[in-house]
Interface confidence: low
């Protein structure tokens, strides 16, 4: 592989690494969305919530005279509970009513697939760098692109989950905004998907310069 191509690959891999960090951050944190009730009584409290793929946290926030509940960063009594994705026999008690389980299960499962693709891609990259097996960058690029697509699907599933929660009769929340974990997931999708496509482009063999050359005739890449 030429020096310029190697430089492009390294820059792309750096972008993909940033995407991996952002994807990991999005998956493990629970600030995808912040939900809040609109109206409150002066001198009481309001209950805001933030949630991710694995758990939801509600926070009892002291109120002032404003119409809104929050921000969520205000001090208050916090109560977190994990979604019971994989043990349906158990009740998730207080938070059973606050999320549409089928959505969070789907989003979490797709996120796991995304992490799986990231691990496979990273293994290919490590093997490629270690033994100069440049051809391994191609499957790596595809794995990263697939990981990005999985993150995108998770993002969309979570968007639907938030919409369902807001529209639900069972929940107090009628206002919402997407938070930093959601932003991390969106950025991860862009970096992983575009980075994967760019890596695929840079790792492909040089196209023949002349009409009479075939791919097989092209100079071997060092």
């Amino acid at each position: 592989m030429s020096q310029t191509k190697m430089l492009k690959v390294r820059v792309t891999l750096f972008c993909i690494l940033a995407g991996i960090v952002l994807a990991m951050t999005a998956v493990v944190t629970d600030h995808w969305a912040v939900l809040s009730p609109h109206m409150e009584h002066h001198n009481t409290t309001c209950e805001a919530a933030h949630f991710g793929l694995w758990r939801i946290c509600t926070k009892r926030i002291p109120m002032d005279d404003s119409k809104t509940c929050g921000p969520i960063t205000l001090p208050g009594e916090k109560n977190c509970s994990y979604f019971r994705h994989f043990n349906p026999g158990e009740s998730s008690e207080i938070f059973e009513f606050t999320t549409q389980k089928e959505y969070s299960i789907s989003a979490a499962a797709i996120a796991i697939f995304s992490l799986g693709f990231i691990i496979l891609g990273s293994l290919c990259v490590l093997l490629s760098l270690g033994k100069k097996r440049d051809y391994l960058l191609r499957p790596a690029s595809m794995f990263y692109a697939f990981a990005g697509l999985c993150i995108l699907v998770s993002v969309e599933v979570m968007r639907q989950s938030v919409k369902r929660m807001i529209d639900s009769e069972d929940t107090v929340w009628i206002e919402y905004y997407y938070s930093w974990s959601f932003a991390c997931a969106c950025a991860a999708f862009i970096l992983l998907f575009l980075g994967g496509l760019a890596l695929l482009l840079f790792s492909l063999p040089r196209m023949p310069r002349n009409p009479w050359e075939s791919c097989m005739d092209a100079e071997p890449e060092h």
Epitope: P37, M39, T44, E93, V172, I174
Partner: antibody, heavy 120, light 111 residues
Framework: QVQLVESGGGVVQPGRSLRLSCAAS????????MYWVRQTPGKGLEWVTV????????YYADSVKGRFTISRDNSKNTLFLQMNSLKTEDTAVYYC?????????????WGQGTMVTVSS | QSVLTQPPSVSGAPGQRVTISCTGS?????????VHWYQQLPGTAPRLLIS???NRPSGVPDRFSGSKSGTSASLAITGLQAEDEADYYC???????????FGGGTQLTVL
Amino acid sequence: QVQLVESGGGVVQPGRSLRLSCAASGFTFSTYGMYWVRQTPGKGLEWVTVISFDGNKKYYADSVKGRFTISRDNSKNTLFLQMNSLKTEDTAVYYCAKSSNWNYGSFDIWGQGTMVTVSS
Amino acid sequence: QSVLTQPPSVSGAPGQRVTISCTGSSSNIGAGYDVHWYQQLPGTAPRLLISYNSNRPSGVPDRFSGSKSGTSASLAITGLQAEDEADYYCQSYDRSLSGSVFGGGTQLTVL
């Protein structure tokens, strides 16, 4: 001062209609969910219906679903309850109440109540 | 039959401590929804006594206190006074009914 004043109660025959009003003052009416709660003579309290601050969300008790309609006019600080196809079991004192937290919190302000008697 | 269960009546002598229980189920109090308490003096509208399980609105004496545990809640009144004679109601939200629910009410008699 913060207060709610109901009106529109009276004696009505079964199957007829009645419209209750609740005038709010002393607080920003347009930012709070509002309820109707009733109390049958000598009995306990029963939640009837709730409406969100903007009027977009409305929920009803099963006993009145399809017959009662809650609405509000934020420009006039007034809450309404349209009661159709009234039954004798709808006889009660009807209170309007202010919600402290949408469909989930306490009723922190109550009106004095208006009596509705459904009798033939 | 009320969704939340309260004793029909309790009584106590002046200065005594009385408690009123409110028992729900996994679809209301047990699901994590808050419990609120109301006092209704004879011939008047109910008034909020305890909100969000244990919060006293301004103007409510500190003789009144509330607590919640599991699927039940309780209202405690210490230093009972003659003017406390009233009906007391608990209220919560029930997810299966998609609305608020009340207890049947407890009549407190000061002996």
